[in-house]
């Protein structure tokens, strides 16, 4: 007989699992890039902005090889779950500049969120602990201006972007290794 | 013009290395990563590996871990690929091309830079 | 490594005619709404080119007698109707896994 009902499935493949994670991850980079050649295009960018409130980036050019796949899906579910509340916060706040986008921001934050439910359903089903956040949540007040919040939007897009190339990058090579 | 511009072709004896430069141009140079591709007389393309130049962070194909070695300087706009140990069957073109891992495609290439490993 | 197998090898045609290009995988590589193949063409002496990315969208600049089309593990390019410039060899390439390959060509002849 199987498991009782309700209790998670445990994987027979974890790599099929991760392969699984991967894809939807790359699928996430896609809309992401896009999204963000479209805000380059609409609201052109002067130079690199930042925003205070987001994740710190995870990685550098010599942490790739030492990468483990429990501190790997743990950080990125931290980060993802920082970008999706600065995705939501974006949508509500971000004023009439970013009301053309946000059919776009919509479907991020559904992918984003599809995403978050795969890492949770993968570290259950590797038996790792959910984490909670390790950094303090900081509450994101209204944008200065209409200017403030299309940098705030460049910043959060060229963020996701770069985090997950990371993951992508981090996942295809755990999955060989696995 | 979106343009990848590699560096001459190279004579090299077995056993050195050799260090390959692309220059882009056209576009925002850390808006794509920079992906090589090998190209063995009468072989299939054959991907080395791929760098994300914002961050670094390069991926390689199994095969060519531990000898290959790509870097980037941004300020310059260029990503280079070293090759070390050499041997006869690392004869071949070698191209530098422009990627993203969403899709991973190769949309801009270089004109390639031919590596002849003789004694 | 997922494995592409090109056929046929080489092909003969004459201008004006249509050329069928089939790609094979050894395992499927579409998935989430994506088809990884991508297809370029490269002639003696120079670079490849792509022609078209994710199974079946043309690249900008690429002229419109070129097609992609397939799912799963069978792929096809087809060249409506061959020009001069249209020989050369034709590559597919998958994105679906880490690494990337490609497959071994099929080279376009004028008969």
């Known amino acids: 007989p199987g498991p009782p009902a309700g209790s998670p499935r445990v994987s027979s493949d974890p790599r099929a699992d991760l392969d699984s994670a991967v894809l939807l991850t790359r699928s996430l980079l896609a809309d992401t890039r896009q999204l963000a050649a479209q805000m380059r295009d609409k609201f052109p960018a002067d130079g690199d902005h930042s925003l205070d409130s987001l994740p710190t980036l995870a990685m550098s050019a010599g942490t790739l090889g030492s990468l483990q796949l429990p501190g790997v899906l743990t950080r990125l579910r931290v980060d993802l779950m920082s970008y999706l509340r600065h995705v939501q916060w974006l949508r509500r706040a971000g004023g009439p500049s970013l009301k053309t986008l946000e059919p776009e921001l919509g479907a991020l934050q559904a992918r984003l969120e599809r995403l978050l439910r795969r890492l949770q359903l993968l570290m259950s089903r590797l038996a790792l602990p959910q984490a909670a956040p390790d950094q303090p949540v900081i509450p994101l007040g209204p944008p200065a201006s209409a200017w403030g919040s299309i940098r705030a939007a460049h910043a959060i897009l060229g963020g996701l972007h770069l985090t997950l190339d990371w993951a992508v990058r981090g996942l295809l090579l755990l999955k060989t290794r696995l | 013009e979106v343009q990848l511009v590699q560096s001459g072709a190279e004579v090299k004896k077995p056993g050195a290395s050799v260090k390959i430069s692309c220059k882009a141009s056209g576009y925002t140079f850390t808006d794509y990563n920079m992906d090589w591709v090998k190209q063995a007389p009468g072989q299939r393309l054959e991907w080395i590996g791929d760098i994300n130049p914002t961050i670094g962070a390069p991926i390689y194909n199994q095969k060519f871990t531990g000898r290959a070695t790509l870097t980037v300087d941004k300020s310059a706009s260029t990503a280079y690929m070293e090759l070390s140990s050499l041997r006869s069957e690392d004869t071949a073109v070698y191209y530098c091309a422009r990627g993203e891992l969403a899709h991973w495609y190769f949309d801009v290439w270089g004109q390639g830079t031919t590596v002849t490993v003789s004694s | 490594d997922i494995v592409l197998t090109q056929s046929p090898a080489s092909l003969a045609l004459s201008p004006g005619e249509r050329a069928t290009l089939s790609c094979r995988a050894s395992k499927s590589v579409s998935t989430e709404g994506y088809s990884y193949i991508h297809w370029y063409q490269q002639k003696p002496g120079q670079a490849p080119r792509l022609l078209i990315y994710l199974a079946s969208n043309l690249e900008s600049g690429v002229p419109a007698r070129f097609s992609g089309s397939g799912s799963g593990t069978d792929f096809t390019l087809t060249i409506s109707s061959l020009e001069e410039e249209d020989f050369a060899t034709y590559y597919c390439?998958?994105?679906?896994?880490?690494?990337?390959?490609f497959g071994q060509g099929t080279k376009l002849e004028i008969k």
């Open positions: 390439q998958h994105s679906r896994d880490l690494p990337p390959t």
